[in-house]
Amino acid sequence: EQAPGTAPCSRGSSWSADLDKCMDCASCRARPHADFCLGCAAAPPAPFRL
């Protein structure tokens, strides 16, 4: 996990300012409104999981 301004997050993850760490883009399926999801690859979202 890197701070913003240093090396980017690893592939498949994106920086969350809210959590102050890199987060898995895969979790955007369940939490599409998380701040870091904006930085994840723009793949079409899967159906939202209950």
Epitope: G12, L19, C25, A26, R29, R31, A46, R49, L50
Partner: antibody
């Protein structure tokens, strides 16, 4: 460092009640979803209940086997959450773990607490 | 509910060799991009510990001897080379939908 400290558990008679507690530290508790997972020799690891974060309207979900019997709740101001268990039966016996998840996997775990339902 | 079937229930592997554990889900737990399958290690008297998330992503701090693969319904956890400290029970878990379910576990013994 991250810690999930559990309390509660012990011996309870069939039909009785028990409340488990879990206090979190070392991470942004209010942003995480919290779950209870239990383990027994008969059923292995079994997810029991989940409470989501404020941004998800504190939505709760339960395993079918505990619906109407167990209630999960949280107190973000004190970084703690709870499992109120009522009408306990022998099949509820096991080790109960509190766990945090951002969305999918169980990242942090409590130390576990034993619950025995027996007369 | 999605049923997770783990095989074998137990295995014994010689020190330095490869351990392979399989997990099959009763329905697909993958999108075109990600698989919602995770692996844990549990030692006696301890809670489970996350090893692999999303089928193949190594959790921070977990040795590279552990690797995961698979998609759809069939997933594999590999440990190579196995070490004495790997003696434990290993579980798979899906997060495709509620209820989240776990496999029955695979007990690994090091010979």
């Amino acid at each position: 460092q991250v810690q999930l400290q559990q309390s509660g558990g012990g011996l309870v008679q069939p039909g009785g009640s028990m409340k488990l507690s879990c206090i979190a530290s070392g991470f942004t508790f209010s942003s995480y979803w919290m779950s209870w997972v239990r383990q027994s020799p008969e059923k292995g690891l079994e997810w029991v209940a989940e409470i989501r974060s404020k941004s998800d309207n504190y939505a709760t979900h339960y395993a079918e086997s505990v619906k109407g019997k167990f209630t999960i709740s949280r107190d973000d101001s004190k970084s703690r959450f709870f499992l109120q268990m009522n009408n306990l039966r022998a099949e509820d016996t096991g080790i109960y773990y509190c766990s945090s998840t951002y969305a999918d996997y169980f990242h942090y775990w409590g130390q576990g607490t034993d619950l025995t339902v027996s007369s | 509910d999605i049923v997770m079937t783990q095989t074998p229930a137990s295995l014994a592997v010689s020190l330095g060799q490869r351990a392979t554990i399989s997990c099959r889900a009763s329905q697909s737990v993958s999108t075109s991009t990600y698989s919602y399958m995770h692996w844990y290690q549990q030692k006696p008297g301890q809670p489970p510990k996350l090893l692999i998330k999303y089928a193949s992503s190594l959790e921070s701090g977990v040795p590279a001897r552990f690797s995961g693969s698979g998609s759809g319904t069939d997933f594999t956890l590999n440990i190579h080379p196995v070490e004495e400290d790997d003696t434990a029970t290993y579980y798979c878990q899906h997060s495709w939908e509620i209820p989240y379910t776990f496999g029955g576990g695979t007990k690994l013994e090091i010979k």
